[in-house]
């Protein structure tokens, strides 16, 4: 829907295992074994979750920020934590999930104060590799469908990712949303660095698949901030 349409991930109500309990992406980390841990794009148990150490937000996935896992904890030990949903407490923009920013200590929608239909969008960066087609999938065209799927197939009309079949997410293509494939390891993903930048895409990529998160490609670490390539990588 519209708020999430403008987010790069455009993910609502993810079906497990790609998403956790709806409405709780910012749950606190628990040290108890077997408790659900909201890491990256997948809820995992503490037993098999490997916290990703970080020094800055840019090193974390699209839906994460870099912070100490315990309140008032050792500032030297920081890991990637799940972003905070709208109306949750925050201290800086990066803590808020895509499409939101930190205002007066609360995550609020980035697009509350302007008409979201204005043509102010910029086309998502496109890279010269075989994963960089604007919509991220092949060009086959089927103009008629008599199949009545409960879950939408690739290219189907959707409002949220739960409308799409397994392995697909609901993401924006121009001014509407369709089911697109979840990104695989090595595929280019979108990492947002600017406040409000989540709303600037007319071709949204899906999020990275299970066990992957969107991180700077190792050989691009030396590149300038603006051109660093992000790809889906194993945790």
């Amino acid at each position: 829907t519209l708020n999430s349409v403008l987010n790069s991930n455009a993910i609502k109500n993810l079906p497990p295992p790609l998403g956790g309990a709806a409405g709780h992406p910012g749950s606190a980390v628990s040290a108890a074994p077997g408790i659900l841990y909201p890491g990256g794009n997948k809820y995992q148990t503490i037993d098999n979750y490997q916290p990703y150490p970080c020094a800055e937000d840019e090193e974390c996935g699209t839906d994460e920020y870099c912070a100490s896992p315990t309140r008032g904890g050792d500032a030297g030990v920081q890991i990637c934590l799940a972003c905070r949903k709208r109306r949750k407490r925050c201290m800086r923009h990066a803590m808020c999930c895509p499409g939101n920013y930190c205002k007066n200590g609360i995550c609020v929608s980035s697009d509350q104060n302007h008409f979201r239909g204005e043509i102010e969008e910029t086309i998502t960066e496109s890279f010269g590799n075989d994963h960089s087609t604007l919509d991220g999938y092949s060009r086959r065209t089927t103009l008629s469908s008599k199949m009545y799927h409960t879950k939408g197939q690739e290219g189907s009309v959707c409002l949220r990712s739960s409308d799409c079949a397994s392995g697909l997410c609901c993401a924006r293509h121009f001014w509407s949303k369709i089911c697109k494939p979840v990104l695989k390891e090595g595929q280019v993903c979108t990492k947002h660095r600017r406040k409000g930048s989540h709303g600037l895409e007319i071709f949204q990529r899906c999020y990275c698949g299970e066990g992957l998160s969107c991180r700077i490609q190792k050989d691009h670490h030396q590149a300038s901030n603006s051109s660093r390539l992000h790809t889906c990588q194993r945790h």
């Epitope: 829907t1 519209l2 349409v5 109500n13 239909g117 089927t142 290219g155 409002l159 924006r172 001014w175």
Partner: antibody, heavy 117, light 107 residues
Amino acid sequence: QVQLVQSGAEVKKPGASVKVSCKASGYTFTENTMHWVRQAPGQGLEWMGGINPHKGGTSYNQKFKGRVTLTVDKSSSTAYMELSRLRSDDTAVYYCARDWLGAMDYWGQGTLVTVSS
Amino acid sequence: DIQLTQSPSSLSASVGDRVTITCITSTDIDDDMNWYRQKPGKVPKLLISEGNTLRPGVPSRFSGSGSGTDFTLTISSLQPEDVATYYCLQSDNLPYTFGQGTKLEIK
């Protein structure tokens, strides 16, 4: 400016099919999903389904149980809605409506389909 | 499917009155609510889109509020041209669903 022009009124017998067209202009047809909404006389609005012209992907309201088929012809920027096995309670005005970020912002003028024996 | 309960089903008010129409959804839809006005014999017109956003060209006397399950369309000062049926539409989850409509008349 954006315009959606629909085909004219139709009178059909129960059990027949009807195909309504919606010709779009004033914007790039493949960039927006096209929805179909119907309104029975004196009644409210009911979403039937939508089609995204980019790949022809569709989504339907399950209420219509396979009776509705949405198609597009990209070369003429035209969307079509075919409703089969018509019943008397399918008598309604059928609208096409352009999707804009989740809302339906521009609507066709409507096509009255009357089902009568 | 998400059910939308719109109230009142009809109302009569005087020019200049403040009018409110409510729409309650069967599940939390965040702020994914849209409001339409349909004048007699005319096509529905989008007034307010998701996030309580006033559409371009729509008079500022119209406003939308609410999130979660409770939503309100307010007309701050009723005008004669506002005689119409008003519909809410949720765009949070397929299938799209509309409220049953509120018929607004001038006293």
